[in-house]
Interface confidence: medium
Amino acid sequence: KVFGRCELAAAMKRHGLDNYRGYSLGNWVCAAKFESNFNTQATNRNTDGSTDYGILQINSRWWCNDGRTPGSRNLCNIPCSALLSSDITASVNCAKKIVSDGNGMNAWVAWRNRCKGTDVQAWIRGCRL
């Protein structure tokens, strides 16, 4: 599923991401935009043999199990395929664990490079939330 901007903002808010660990909803929508272009089925492979999955491009070396990443920790205790569902519950729950891990949203390279320090509220402007 490819979400609309406001559709995703509403879904993320429903799942409790607004101001989760101090990160406003705009941060999460911005991260999803530049990680996956709002596509729940996005997959991207990394040079270390791991793969990033879903709307928030969660990595198989640390957070989920795709059955083929050497040394996978699976800290979210889920199959990576669950992160590709049109229902973003699994991605959100795992993202909450990631953002609580110590580095905050710096764990997402796209957020660090494209969202951090910008007017992230622009990503939810005009949305009926």
């Epitope: 089925q41 997959t43 492979r45 040079t47 043999g49 795709d66 059955g67 083929r68 990443t69 050497p70 199959p79 990576c80 395929s81 590709l84």
Partner: antibody, heavy 116, light 107 residues
Framework: QVQLQESGAEVMKPGASVKISCKAT????????IEWVKQRPGHGLEWIGE????????YYNEKFKGKATFTADTSSNTAYMQLSSLTSEDSAVYYC?????????WGQGTTLTVSS | DIELTQSPATLSVTPGDSVSLSCRAS??????LHWYQQKPHESPRLLIK???QRASGIPSRFSGSGSGTDFTLSINSVETEDFGMYFC?????????FGGGTKLEIK
């Protein structure tokens, strides 16, 4: 137990297309990548690409882009590979395998012969 | 693409001999190297995963070693059922690639 059952041998004319199937049993089909491998005598094993059935996400070896197309039907736990514009170079045994980085589980292979 | 070069192409041995098969990668692949055995008209069979881990059900006479670019599959006291083709495969990057194979034949 995990099993991958491929469709039977095919004899096709040059220029035609063929669709090979791989039915998976004994595990959660949507969770694992299905990979496709080509074997020709004297050419060893070649990785064609992969599909994650749960999402339909696909990756292709550049060499096989435009030649192979992967699909999956999660209702029947079956992955498919279509090969188009067949030539004699496509005559080979084609295997599906479960993608665990390594390949512990393989199909029995589908022999494709392209001949006029 | 990562190229895997296997040597020798053919190895003629007598049952009871011990042998080593080599697989060399064109760039470092850490331990992401796997070994397969294939008999005529059969699918490949996984022997060793991640350079040195024996797959389920594989006899202890098979062992693997190496890291980086140079890898070895060793068979201690070859048995008649061990004859066939042996392939290595890397999973360090895409596309996945295989070596050209080593044929283990009876002398």
């Amino acid at each position: 137990q995990v099993q991958l059952q491929e469709s039977g041998a095919e004899v096709m004319k040059p220029g035609a297309s063929v669709k090979i199937s791989c039915k998976a049993t004994g595990y959660t089909f949507t969770t694992y990548w299905i990979e496709w491998v080509k074997q020709r005598p004297g050419h060893g094993l070649e990785w064609i690409g992969e599909i994650l059935p749960g999402s339909g996400s696909t990756y292709y070896n550049e060499k096989f882009k435009g030649k192979a197309t992967f699909t999956a039907d999660t209702s029947s736990n079956t992955a498919y590979m279509q090969l188009s514009s067949l030539t004699s170079e496509d005559s080979a045994v084609y295997y599906c395998a479960r993608g665990d980085g390594f390949y512990y589980y393989w199909g029995q292979g589908t022999t494709l012969t392209v001949s006029s | 693409d990562i190229e895997l070069t296997q040597s020798p192409a053919t190895l003629s041995v007598t049952p009871g001999d011990s042998v080593s098969l080599s697989c060399r990668a064109s760039q470092s692949i850490s331990n992401n190297l796997h070994w397969y055995q294939q008999k005529p008209h059969e699918s490949p069979r996984l022997l060793i995963k991640y350079a040195s881990q024996r797959a389920s059900g594989i006899p202890s006479r098979f062992s693997g070693s190496g890291s980086g670019t140079d890898f070895t599959l060793s068979i201690n006291s070859v048995e008649t059922e061990d004859f066939g083709m042996y392939f290595c495969q890397q999973s360090n990057s895409w596309p996945r690639t295989f070596g050209g194979g080593t044929k283990l034949e009876i002398k």
